[in-house]
């Protein structure tokens, strides 16, 4: 159904192979990515309220697909931004909660409950919103828009408690 407005291969924005996305735009895509659909010649990425397409063989397309497959994008993305300089300290453990998020929309009540449920968090840049955690289990939240099924992904149901800490020799490096 390539070309169908309501089908999974409708493109809101097509990115040419000649001009791949900037680092900043890729970070935005990583954060808001909800799903992808393999079409005949291109891949369509569904974000929260819009879509973008790129050629199947474009490196950035394969990178984003891989990122979502490994649950390193979208619901789970920690939101590192380029040129970050300041890092928040990890918060003290309080209780146990699930990792993952079902939406980019966080109400104040959700944010408060998130804070109360948090155990130690990964270190995040100031001003960034971690979408590592939400209130739903996997497959509970499914939003249908224009014929597309957007559900909480694998990361949304991470039963494992929150990250203990950042680890590794390069764990506190700044920009990607």
């Amino acid at each position: 159904n390539e070309g169908s407005v309501t089908g999974s291969c409708y493109c809101g924005k097509r990115i040419s192979s000649d001009s791949p996305p900037s680092v900043q735009f890729m970070n935005r895509l990583r954060k808001h990515l909800r799903a992808y659909h393999r079409c005949l010649y291109y891949t369509r990425f569904q974000l929260l309220s819009w879509s973008v397409c790129g050629g199947n063989k474009d490196p950035w397309v394969q990178e984003l697909m891989s990122c979502l497959d490994l649950k390193e994008c979208g619901h789970a993305y920690s939101g590192i931004v380029a040129h970050q300089k300041h890092l928040l300290p990890t918060s003290p453990p309080i209780s146990q909660a699930s990792e993952g998020a079902s939406s980019d929309i966080h109400t104040p009540a959700q944010m408060l409950l998130s804070t109360l449920q948090s155990t130690q968090r990964p270190t995040l840049p100031v001003g960034s919103l971690s979408s590592d955690k939400e209130l739903t289990r996997p497959n509970e939240t499914t939003i249908h828009t224009a014929g597309h099924s957007l559900a909480a992904g694998p990361e949304a149901g991470e039963n494992q408690k929150q990250p203990e800490k950042n680890a590794g020799p390069t764990a506190r490096t700044s920009a990607t």
């Epitope: 697909m65 497959d69 390193e72 920690s78 694998p154 494992q160």
Partner: antibody
Amino acid sequence: EVQLVESGGGLVQPGGSLKLSCAASGFTFSNAVMNWVRQASGKGLEWVARIRTKPNNYATFYADSVKGRFTFSRDDSKNTAYLQMNSLKTEDTAMYYCTAWTTEGIYWGQGTLVTVSS
Amino acid sequence: DIVMTQSPDSLAVSAGETVTINCKSSQSLLYSGNQKNYLAWYQQKPGQSPKLLIYWASTRQSGVPDRFSGSGSGTDFTLTISSVQAEDVAVYYCQQYYDTPWTFGGGTKVEIK
């Protein structure tokens, strides 16, 4: 060819420490989600720990049985993952496998044996 | 945690027969973001590390004989070994990687009569 080579296992007394290493090659290490899985002799497989990629702050996750005692880290510049194991218990005795989760599959090393005994 | 229930625990078949191993998860492993099932199958022979046979529930790992196939979606999955050979004697495990912690089935021991 993808390779994961674990090292650092050995015999240690209860309460002691060991640091396991996992040297990777044959794939883009920085894009892989790394995990440790262990297997006691004659038993099934048990997930131990996970570390995410740089864009996600190298966030780490641990099985309840090792939380607070084990620390997972990675050095993307050296294509190596590490598992620091402190306050070891006899029940930590197992073969420890390093795994790399990529879109092309989940790769496993040959394992390194950790024996905790007095 | 997602519970993986594997059956049978063990089975003995004659060479050339077809083996079917079942794996059931306590919740769906199908991710709507990519329509993939986060399930893998492994073969483990004595003294060896687990060998990946199948990932994404049905994708055969490179180098794995085509007599091994995976099927299923959601919560019910099957590993089929058609025309079992002597070298297939091993323990087979299913594993979900949809969620942390990764969890494994209890294993199915396959023997040749």
